[in-house]
């Protein structure tokens, strides 16, 4: 079945009067960018920049677009078929066990360790023991133990954004 392009799929400046276009479901499902009507007879388009759906679905409502927190940058905006993509600002990263916030990367490794990996939006700097080459996954070292890899004081272990 051919993809249905509705007014809601267009950028806001391209849209005419606000009006949710409808089409018919295919085997009880509506295409990405739409949700199903209460009676199951229509597919109603999501609202551009407000909500979305990514798959063929029988959802009564489209999903709300994510809004990037302060401390995050928007890599790509929300469309009717794709959620917003947010990324931690430079110098911060998001851990798997605390995905709700970006934490500041450490500025250096503890004494006796060398940096083998840079700060990325997904990971802190990576440190290994000079001799053994084993990774260090401990807490941020005390100031006097830190060997900074750049000027300035070590970062605090946690930075709450938003």
């Amino acid at each position: 079945e051919s993809a249905l392009i509705t007014q809601q799929d267009l950028a806001p400046q391209q849209r005419a009067a606000p009006q949710q276009k409808r089409s018919s479901p295919s085997e009880g499902l509506c295409p990405p960018g739409h949700h199903i009507s209460e009676d199951g007879r229509d597919c109603i388009s999501c609202k551009y920049g407000q909500d979305y759906s990514t798959h063929w679905n029988d959802l009564l409502f489209c999903l709300r677009c994510t809004r990037c927190d302060s401390g995050e940058v928007e890599l790509s905006p929300c469309t009717t078929t794709r959620n917003t993509v947010c990324q931690c600002e430079e110098g911060t990263f998001r851990e798997e066990d605390s995905p709700e916030m970006c934490r500041k990367c450490r500025t250096g490794c503890p004494r006796g360790m060398v940096k083998v990996g840079d700060c990325t939006p997904w990971s802190d700097i990576e440190c290994v023991h000079k001799e053994s080459g084993t990774k260090h996954s401990g807490e941020v070292p005390a100031v006097e133990e830190t060997v900074t890899s750049s000027p300035g004081t070590p970062a605090s272990p946690c930075s709450l954004s938003g």
Epitope: Q50, L60, L63
Partner: nanobody, 127 residues
């Protein structure tokens, strides 16, 4: 985690009105669709009404359409269910529930998709 707390239940005469409230708290609570469900003694829990994250889109069970109205405050953290022309058959424990959205199968009693439930509030309608 999203926490849901219902209030406003009570006893009322047939033909009367009652307004239930559901207070949603927790990270991104206002991003969720919220629905009201009810369970009468000896019966399955059933869908009553739901609204999307903004409160702009609403859906009702056929049996309550025209009598019940679901609404959401601007902050998105309180969802109300205004019930009028109440009948003894409306007697049940009313539950608030939240999910990113609800599948249409929820209208037929498929509740597996729901992420969060409140504790419920009792509504009794006497004739």
């Amino acid at each position: 985690q999203v926490q849901l707390q219902e209030s406003g239940g009570g006893s009322v005469q047939a033909g009367g009105s009652l307004t239930l409230s559901c207070a949603a708290s927790g990270r991104a609570a206002s991003d969720y669709a919220v629905g009201w469900f009810r369970q009468a003694p000896g019966k399955e829990r059933e869908f009553v009404a739901a609204c999307n994250w903004s409160g702009e889109d609403t859906v009702y069970a056929y049996i309550v359409k025209g009598r019940f109205t679901i609404s959401r405050d601007n902050a998105g953290n309180t969802v109300s269910l205004r019930m009028s022309s109440l009948e003894p058959e409306d007697t049940a424990v009313y539950y608030c529930a939240a999910a990113p959205s609800f599948s249409r199968s929820v209208l037929d009693g498929n509740l597996s998709q729901i992420d969060y439930w409140g504790q419920g509030t009792q509504v009794t309608v006497s004739s």
